[in-house]
């Protein structure tokens, strides 16, 4: 599953919640990032999260003629230099810093399952999807297509606005 | 390689109904979404909607929503649009679309159909 | 709903020619921006998305460029077989809206 380009294709930057609209928040602990799933209240301002779109080949079409089989990779960023990463070991998901070119951990495929909602899926571990678990993001085993409507990989994108990359 | 085949023209009366087709090949049908967008003298091109045969998840542009039905069969790899109390102006050529990426709507349109053309007289 | 407004609504030129259209936004769409090519009793076929991304097989003759609202897709050295209604789309959010087409033809 290879990037095709280095530089992104589109950026985004965005406030993510969950499908049951809690907020995804980031906090910055004993000089490291905690993610938490929380209900905001009314006032209270959303993180927000750059999302940098790369496109990949598919990996069953990478010897094929390249017009078909075309993927969307995403990298999400909430602040300067740290990234979401998969620790596929720990089943986890953690805040990074990380200098271009990103580890694979960096990157997730991306997934409409519905029009309004997103599913991050590790790219170092097919079928593992960024999750919500106990109030916290973790990596959340889906074993068949079926399955990937279910709710607590299904996440919200309120765009802010456009990032303008050069 | 990837193709989009649709139905042939149609003449319906005023006030019917019609369902069209669009049959599929060269790709995985399950793992891409369909669009459909209309071509008329009037109004130029105008997206109606889209479908994502994995979950029959749907989304339509508001002028289309009591319009345009989409249904998909899996087990054929076709997705179908049906347009339901016709009016003049619903004369147009209708085609099915599919974006450029795997499991994702950009709502691009990389590969079209034909196109299918509706006329509706009395 | 974002309009999408395009200029000239039709040119003639000569092959060989530069040609550069333009693509107005009512509002800020980032690069979500594609451009399609549609000759007479054809589907249209896309040429730009991602406002500069040329598609897979598109000549490298046509350059997409611009962000925000304000849009431009350009073809260097025109050939005969570019004679054709070219339409820009805002892309990513619902609804995507077209621009009502610049028509290209031959002298």
């Known amino acids: 599953m290879s990037i095709t380009g280095i530089s992104p294709i589109t950026e985004y930057l965005a406030s993510l919640s969950t499908y049951n609209d809690q907020s995804i928040t980031f906090a910055l602990e004993d000089e490291s990032y905690e993610i938490y799933v929380e209900d905001l209240k009314k006032d209270e301002k959303k993180d927000k999260v750059l999302l940098s779109y790369y496109e990949s080949q598919h990996p069953s079409n990478e010897s094929g003629d390249g017009v078909d089989g075309k993927m969307l990779m995403v990298t999400l960023s909430p602040t300067k230099d740290f990234w979401l990463h998969a620790n596929n070991k720990e089943h986890s998901v953690e805040l990074h810093k990380s200098e271009k070119p990103l580890p694979d951990q960096a990157f997730f495929v991306l997934h409409n399952m519905h029009s309004n909602s997103v599913s991050f899926e590790s790219k170092t571990d097919p079928g593992v999807f960024i999750g919500v678990k106990d109030n916290h993001l973790a990596l959340i085993k889906v074993d068949s297509s079926e399955n990937l409507s279910t709710e607590n990989i299904l996440f919200k994108l309120s765009e802010t606005h456009h990032h303008h990359h050069h | 390689q990837v193709k989009l085949l649709q139905s042939g023209a149609a003449l319906v009366k005023p006030g019917a109904s019609v369902k069209m087709s669009c049959a599929t090949s060269g790709f995985s049908f399950t793992d891409y979404w369909v669009s459909w967008v209309k071509q008329s003298h009037g109004k130029g091109l105008e997206w109606i909607g889209e479908?994502?045969?994995?979950?029959?998840?749907?989304n339509f542009n508001e002028n289309f929503k009591g319009k345009a039905t989409l249904t998909v069969d899996k087990s054929t790899s076709t997705a179908y649009m049906e347009l339901s109390r016709l009016t003049s102006e619903d004369s147009a050529i209708y085609y099915c679309?599919?974006?450029?990426?795997?499991?994702?709507?950009?709502?691009?349109?990389?590969?079209w159909g034909q196109g299918t053309l509706v006329t509706v007289s009395s | 709903n974002i309009v999408m407004t395009q200029s000239p609504k039709s040119m003639s030129i000569s092959v060989g020619d530069r040609v550069t259209m333009n693509c107005k936004a009512s509002?800020?769409?980032?690069?979500?921006l594609a451009w399609y090519q549609q000759k007479p009793g054809q589907s249209p076929k896309l040429l730009i998305y991602y406002a500069s991304n040329r598609y897979t097989g598109v000549p490298d003759r046509f350059t997409g460029g611009g962000y925000g609202t304000d849009f431009t897709l350009t073809i260097n050295s025109v050939q005969a077989e570019d004679a054709a209604f070219y339409y820009c789309?805002?892309?990513?959010?619902?609804?995507?809206?077209f621009g009502g087409g610049t028509k290209v033809e031959l002298r």
């Open positions: 789309q805002r892309i990513y959010n619902s609804p995507p809206t």
């Open positions: 479908i994502y045969p994995n979950s029959g998840a749907d």
């Open positions: 509002q800020n769409v980032g690069n979500n």
């Open positions: 679309t599919r974006g450029p990426y795997y499991y994702s709507t950009q709502i691009i349109f990389a590969y």
